[in-house]
């Protein structure tokens, strides 16, 4: 429906509070280096303008698009050229090119200081004295570090953040109450950001069709009782929501997400028996709950897939009449029967089936040609099954930290050109798959493992895209979305790599190592391990294990010494020399 004023329309739909929060998130995701106060000023100016449009939709400039209004506002920032360099050139462009330009300048790894958590009392005082500013600062800090964070979901996180402070700042032991909650929110936030980053990458790099296919698989698994047309209705609306959020249209995105939640709750009977509890919650919780709802039970009367997709005499006729609809139905039917498969595997199966039909429907005996098509799926299914079995066995044998090390060695040998911080971050996240998925029941393991790995490998892809250094990474990241994980799994040791020259500084440690948290110590050790592999790519796992054990013993010894710094200075070079010998 056409509205005289888009900004007034969204202000009225969303309400002032959500409107302001979403504009703050949008601006923070675009201008990631701007100070908080500058953003607050811009948000207040936009909000005051929106109110004039609500009062009179025909008022001056109220008919302008949101991109025009927001872009004009961003381009008033005085220090744009000094702070952002060539991003300032975006302001010379007209819409829609200007917005596209801003999107291209979003930085997945902005040069921002790590967030330091103040003392609990300091945080509680700030929360109690200036609650609104405190919560808006949270939105700003998360949004600028995660420029693709799913905006309506970030408002949900802010609500949880507020609830944690409201409860814990009253508690007898504030820290014991608050810190675990903040840790959990941080971890959930990082996971949410990474999942959304994959959605945006799917849309931006592989197009709407790829995203819709993935969504059909997931929604069909969740709502196996729903009719195909209901699944595609939800998928179509979901695609619109994510296209908007990934494109920076956060007000439209949040508004449409609320509409989708409303539709789903009004049509529970056609979708799933699992939505009832979600639908009783207020908006932000409701949308979050619907997005994470468990799979409904499969209908009992599902007939064999082969009836319609192998045995039927009309397979080629139906395929030829409407290829996209036929393939959509195949994906829906297969997915609703297989909650135990990963979405990526289901997409590979659909791709294989389509390729077989393309080939067979052009032959004299199509049925004879595609009769065994489902048998051809077997190796595709066994690949992720073996991946899960092998990696969960390793995880159970090693535990998370050593499993991360195993993956770090594996990936450093595959793509040694990638920067050490990226290899460490990605391998640590890959290793968390064990903790997250290996304890799950058999039927949930594969979707958990492979779809989680897809999210983590996408982090590697987006970080690598910023500064490409490896053709092999580029190839795996760009050739096929559904085959990214198998592509990385199939990479062997890079035999063309010339070992990195030894740099003593890389392997020099100081007493500050002893004051680091366990996590920070692990990162230090894993950084050294990656550098070691880059220096000695032919080293065996046994050799590396020995060196790492010696290294752990060295750190433990020096951290217990009276003169820690002297110990590090004396014992460090000895360890390096011994390691050189062990790896020769």
């Amino acid at each position: 429906d056409a509205h005289k004023s888009e900004v007034a329309h969204r202000f009225k739909d969303l309400g002032e509070e959500h409107f302001k929060d979403l504009v703050l998130v949008a601006f923070s995701q675009y201008l990631q280096q701007c100070p908080f106060e500058e953003h607050l000023k811009l948000v207040n100016e936009v909000t005051e303008f929106a109110k004039t449009c609500v009062a009179d939709e025909t008022a001056e400039n109220c008919d302008k698009s949101l991109h025009t209004l927001f872009g004009d506002k961003l381009c008033t920032v005085a220090t744009l050229r000094e702070t952002y360099g060539d991003m300032a050139d975006c302001c010379a462009k007209q819409e829609p090119e200007r917005n596209e330009c801003f999107l291209q300048h979003k930085d997945d790894k902005p040069d921002l200081p790590p967030l330091v958590r103040p003392e609990v009392d300091v945080m509680c005082t700030a929360f109690q004295e200036h609650e609104d500013t405190f919560l808006k600062k949270y939105l700003y800090e998360v949004a600028r570090r995660h420029p693709y964070f799913y905006a309506p979901e970030l408002l949900f996180f802010a609500q949880k953040y507020k609830a944690a402070f409201t409860e814990c700042c009253q508690a007898a032991d504030k820290g014991a109450c608050l810190l675990p909650k903040l840790d959990e929110l941080r971890d959930q936030g990082k996971a949410s950001s990474a999942k959304q980053r994959l959605k945006c990458a799917s849309l931006q790099k592989f197009g709407e069709r790829a995203f819709k296919a993935w969504s059909v698989a997931r929604v069909s698994q969740r709502f196996p009782k729903a009719d195909f047309t209901e699944v595609t209705k939800v998928v179509t609306d979901l695609t619109k929501v994510h296209t908007e959020c990934c494109h920076g249209d956060l007000l439209e995105c949040a508004d449409d997400r609320a509409e989708l939640a409303k539709y789903m709750c009004e049509n529970q009977d056609s979708l799933s028996s699992k939505l009832k509890e979600c639908c009783e919650k207020p908006l932000l919780e409701k949308s979050h709950c619907l997005a994470h709802v468990e799979n409904d039970e499969m209908p009992a009367d599902l007939h064999a897939l082969t009836d319609d997709y192998v045995e039927s005499k009309d397979v080629c006729k139906n395929y030829a009449e409407a290829k996209d609809v036929f393939m959509g139905m195949f994906l829906y039917e297969y997915s609703r029967r297989h909650p135990d498969y990963s979405a990526m595997l289901l997409l590979r199966l659909a791709k294989a089936y389509e390729a077989t039909l393309e080939k067979c429907c052009a032959t004299a005996d199509p049925h004879g040609c595609y009769a065994k098509v489902f048998d051809e799926f077997q190796p595709l299914v066994e690949d992720p099954q073996n991946l899960v079995k092998h990696n969960c066995e390793l995880f159970e044998q090693f535990g998370e930290y050593k499993f991360q090390n195993e993956l770090l060695v594996r990936y450093t040998k595959k793509v040694p050109q990638v920067s050490t911080p990226t290899l460490v971050e990605v391998s640590r996240n890959l290793g968390k798959v064990g903790t997250k998925c290996c304890k799950q029941p058999e039927a949930k393991r594969m979707p958990c493992v492979e779809d989680y790995l897809s999210v983590v490998l996408n982090q590697l892809c987006v970080l690598h895209e910023k500064t490409p250094v490896s053709d092999r990474v580029t190839k795996c990241c760009t050739e096929s979305l559904v085959n990214r994980r198998p592509c990385f799994s199939a990479l062997e040791v890079d035999e063309t790599y010339l070992p990195k020259a030894f740099n003593a500084e890389t392997f020099t440690f100081h007493a500050d190592m002893c004051t680091l948290s366990e996590k920070e110590q692990q990162v230090k050790k894993q950084t050294a391990l990656a550098e070691l592999v880059k220096h000695k790519p032919k080293a065996t796992n046994e050799q590396l294990k020995t060196v790492m054990e010696d290294f752990a013993a060295f750190v433990e010894k020096c951290c217990k010494a009276d003169d820690k710094e002297a110990c590090f200075a004396e014992e460090g070079p000895k360890l390096v020399a011994a390691s050189e010998t062990a790896l020769a």
Epitope: D227, F228, T229, E230, T232, K233, T236, D237, Y263
Partner: nanobody
Framework: EVQLLESGGGLVQPGGSLRLSCAAS????????MGWVRQAPGKGREWVSL????????YYADSVKGRFTISRDNSKNTLYLQMNSLRAEDTAVYYC??????????WGQGTLVTVSS
């Protein structure tokens, strides 16, 4: 009892347009996906288009994509098919049909569309 009554067929020249209508009764129209199916002389039935109850999601056979537009007015219990750039191969009896999960379970009597110069 479910009733579907098509209208709007007729003779049209190649490149011309027609709009078919289908009046539905005997069921809760806005709860069901609806569609159009056609049968050319001497041929089998061919699916043409589908529309979700909300009217916001549509599906088309590849042969009509970009030329035909399906729509519905739930307040009038009516289904439409706007046919543009008609070709001789579009000549057929067009049936309005009600969709139930995976198949069409009810059909109208059909309306004849003839594309000829």
């Amino acid at each position: 009892e479910v009733q579907l009554l098509e209208s709007g067929g007729g003779l049209v020249q190649p490149g011309g347009s027609l709009r078919l209508s289908c009046a539905a009764s005997g069921f809760t129209f806005n709860h069901y996906t609806m569609g159009w199916v056609r049968q050319a002389p001497g041929k089998g039935r061919e699916w043409v288009s589908l529309i979700h109850p909300s009217g916001t999601v549509t599906y088309y056979a590849d042969s009509v994509k970009g030329r035909f537009t399906i729509s519905r007015d739930n307040s009038k219990n009516t289904l439409y098919l706007q046919m543009n750039s008609l070709r001789a191969e579009d000549t057929a009896v067009y049936y309005c049909a009600k969709w139930e999960k995976k198949y069409f379970d009810y059909w109208g009597q059909g309306t004849l569309v003839t594309v000829s110069s």
